[in-house]
Amino acid sequence: QNAQLQRELRGLRETLSNFTASTEAQVKGLSTQGGNVGRKMKSLESQLEKQQKDLSEDHSSLLLHVKQFVSDLRSLSCQMAALQGNGSERACCPVNWVEHERSCYWFSRSGKAWADADNYCRLEDAHLVVVTSWEEQKFVQHHIGPVNTWMGLHDQNGPWKWVDGTDYETGFKNWRPEQPDDWYGHGLGGGEDCAHFTDDGRWNDDVCQRPYRWVCETELDKASQEPPLL
């Protein structure tokens, strides 16, 4: 009977050992499978994230394009209305001009003497830029960058005057320290009678003959309304 029990015990041990080995193998297999599933999920997650990011970028890009399209359409519709009208009222800025606070601005990319720049703007039914506020200063500065650029301010006939008649004394000023100084030491004859934006945006007076870039400005007609979109 003892031998019988011994045999049964051996059998049970064997069965248990086989079961343990088999279970371990299954667990190992499941773990490997789980790892693969985890990796697959991670891969799918990152793919999904990328797709979402791409989609979001596409959406933003599309929105920008739509905005630009609407703006172009409005501009085109306005230009057409201007061409059909008698031209006395301006409801929108001409092509290649930038609108800001109900004014239109054109930024040159070449240089001219102050008088030639002034004349150029007049021929465009505009005037050299007249800076009336800190916000306008920042706007113009942002567009011209760190480049000497003429504005519509001069003292060729005595006191400083804005070309559109804006009062100089009570108006906005942004001179560099110690400026204007009407410096005669440049050796070009005379002093300095024309104002320009310097590389940091603040103003300086200089010889009017210098060939600096310039900015033209024209005001949108206050009474006219934007035409509806076509």
């Epitope: 506020s133 800190w134 920042k138 108006g171 906005f172 000023k173 940091d200």
Partner: antibody, heavy 117, light 107 residues
Framework: QVQLVQSGAEVKKPGASVKVSCKAS????????LHWVRQAPGQGLEWMGW????????NYAQKFQGRVTMTRDTSISTAYMGLSSLRSDDTAVYYC??????????WGQGTLVTVSS | DIQMTQSPSSVSASVGDRVTITCRAS??????LAWYQQKPGKAPKLLIY???SLQSGVPSRFSGSGSGTDFTLTISSLQPEDFAIYYC?????????FGPGTKVDIK
């Protein structure tokens, strides 16, 4: 988020100088002008001037011309305001503030400068 | 320099009241005006810029209006956290100048 963190309180003797710092974070430091505004105890706000962190250009209120110096260190996004020949009426909280659209949109927490003998 | 004046210099009001503060510039500043709120020991906080634009995160009970020389800040229904000093500031030309402030306290 945009943050302007200023240096700690200072106590100075009349005739001395002070230098207050303003560390910017949460935006591109060189893209916005920084202004300095002060407020004497129980008084209103007084604009002192601005610095353009990109160019280093400054514009000081006439009242502080010759006594104030605004500088910046773009490598650490920090602006500084120095005031010399201090008097007792310079005792105030000094604020740095970022230039916004026709406004100062973000302000530092303020630095109290006490001038006393 | 452009002088800024505010009225009233102080106002006593209750929660739920409509409060109006006016600000006048000594010369035209277009719409380049800002309104700030300041609480004791704190830095001013921007409420309104460009005379009527509400700064992001500011409750809609605050509104601003005006252009040229006359401006108004309105709090449509005063809340407990609105008791503070309010300043206007012109940002048209240098030197930038502030109004003397209007203290809004509890009635």
């Amino acid at each position: 988020q945009v943050q302007l963190v200023q240096s700690g309180a200072e106590v100075k003797k009349p005739g001395a100088s002070v230098k207050v710092s303003c560390k910017a974070s949460g935006y591109t430091f060189t893209d916005y002008y920084l202004h300095w505004v002060r407020q004497a105890p129980g008084q209103g706000l007084e604009w002192m001037g601005w610095i353009h962190p990109n160019s280093g250009g400054t514009n000081y209120a006439q009242k502080f011309q010759g006594r104030v110096t605004m500088t910046r260190d773009t490598s650490i996004s920090t602006a500084y305001m120095g005031l010399s020949s201090l008097r007792s009426d310079d005792t105030a909280v000094y604020y740095c503030a970022r230039d916004g659209t026709s406004s100062f949109d973000y302000w530092g927490q303020g630095t109290l400068v006490t001038v006393s003998s | 320099d452009i002088q800024m004046t505010q009225s009233p210099s102080s106002v006593s009001a209750s929660v739920g009241d409509r409060v109006t503060i006016t600000c006048r510039a000594s010369q035209g500043i277009s719409r380049w005006l800002a309104w700030y709120q300041q609480k004791p020991g704190k830095a001013p906080k921007l409420l309104i810029y460009g005379a009527s634009s509400l700064q992001s995160g500011v409750p809609s009970r605050f509104s601003g209006s005006g252009s040229g020389t006359d401006f108004t800040l309105t709090i449509s229904s005063l809340q407990p956290e609105d008791f503070a000093i309010y300043y206007c500031q012109q940002a048209n030309s240098f030197p930038f100048t502030f109004g003397p402030g209007t203290k809004v306290d509890i009635k």
